[in-house]
């Protein structure tokens, strides 16, 4: 059956610095295995930007980090029985 | 194929460049990255520099002091090196950064080294 | 800054043994894990990349595993061509720290 998903380890509020690489993480179980996307601000985070990779394990890494990159980051798990949604503040300087 | 240039003995707070030129496969399409080896055979990362040169990176240890640059029309991959430090003392090495799925960072060709030697 | 604890620093096997290197990192890096081999004299080369995964080139004979916050590289039937200093590096978040190096030998 379906369950609606649970985030375990979310990500967390952090300070980076510009042009180093920063990772925000989102573990989350369900049935089926819950489906990971992020938004920034409301909209959603592209993976054609370059400097974004979707690792394994619900790991969102940006390189090269830029002051617009600043913002609130949520992790939206979903499955066919619902969704669950954790955010994070990152300020890059 | 990658071959390093430009490394010798500097005495320090001297520059150095080292370049780094590259054949063989389509340069501007990769991102590099510079890494160098101390004499107790510690590795250290550098620098990284996107494909096409607008975005770089350099640990604590260096900022300020090193900076990256390429030159996509040939090939040239640089890394400018001043107010240099008896530590800074290593072999230098320019590398490739795999294109890999999933999307981890990983240097899957290496050059053979140049050796940068601070002292007075 | 994560840090990379390696161990052992140095060890000497058998042609035909099995040995096993580990990776220690100071929090969690999801996999985010690459190994080097860098025989004497010789440029690095990349062995395995995402802790599990192998390099095109490279023998079945080498594997990785792991997860969370500890590692290991599995070297099977050992070669006297595997003669190398093995290092691991976290590809997690900035600086991509190296861990120290171990360097293998032949009995």
């Known amino acids: 059956g379906s369950m609606g998903p649970v985030i375990r380890q979310g990500p967390v509020n952090q300070t980076v610095a510009v042009d180093g690489t920063f990772v925000l993480s989102c573990v989350a179980t369900g049935s089926p295995v819950p489906t990971i996307l992020w938004r920034k601000d409301g909209v959603l985070v592209s993976t054609q930007d370059s400097r974004i990779k979707q690792l394994e394990n619900g790991v969102l890494q940006i390189r090269y980090a830029k002051l617009g990159d600043t913002g609130r980051y949520t992790c939206i798990a979903s499955t066919p029985s619902g969704e669950a949604t954790w955010s994070a503040y990152i300020e890059v300087q | 194929q990658l071959v390093e240039s430009g490394g010798g003995v500097v005495q320090p707070g001297g520059s150095l460049k080292l370049s780094c030129a590259a054949s063989?496969?389509?340069?501007?399409?990769?991102?590099m990255s510079w890494v160098r080896q101390t004499p107790d055979k510690r590795l250290e990362l550098v620098a990284t520099?996107?494909?096409?040169?607008?975005?770089?990176y350099y640990p604590d240890s260096v900022k300020g002091r090193f900076t990256s640059s390429r030159d996509n029309a040939k090939n040239i991959l640089y890394l400018q090196m001043s107010s240099l430090k008896s530590e800074d003392t290593a072999m230098y090495y320019c590398?490739?950064?795999?294109?890999?799925?999933?999307?981890?960072?990983?240097?899957?060709?290496w050059g053979q080294g140049t050796s940068v030697t601070v002292s007075s | 800054d994560i840090q990379m604890t390696q161990s052992p620093a140095s060890l000497s096997a058998s042609v035909g043994e099995t040995v096993t290197i580990t990776c220690g990192a100071s929090e969690n890096i999801y996999g985010a894990l690459t190994w080097y081999q860098r025989k004497q004299g010789k440029s690095p080369q990349l062995l395995i990349y995402?802790?599990?995964n192998l390099a095109d080139d490279k023998s079945s004979r080498f594997s990785g595993s792991g997860s969370g916050r500890q590692y290991s590289l599995k070297i099977s039937s050992l070669h006297p061509d595997d003669v190398a200093t093995y290092y691991c590096?976290?590809?997690?978040?900035?600086?991509?720290?190296f861990g120290s190096g171990t360097k293998l030998e032949i009995k």
């Open positions: 520099i996107n494909s096409n040169g607008g975005s770089t």
């Open positions: 590096q976290n590809v997690l978040s900035t600086p991509f720290t």
């Open positions: 590398a490739r950064e795999a294109l890999l799925r999933p999307a981890y960072y990983a240097l899957d060709y």
């Open positions: 995402g802790a599990i």
């Open positions: 063989g496969f389509t340069f501007s399409t990769y991102d």
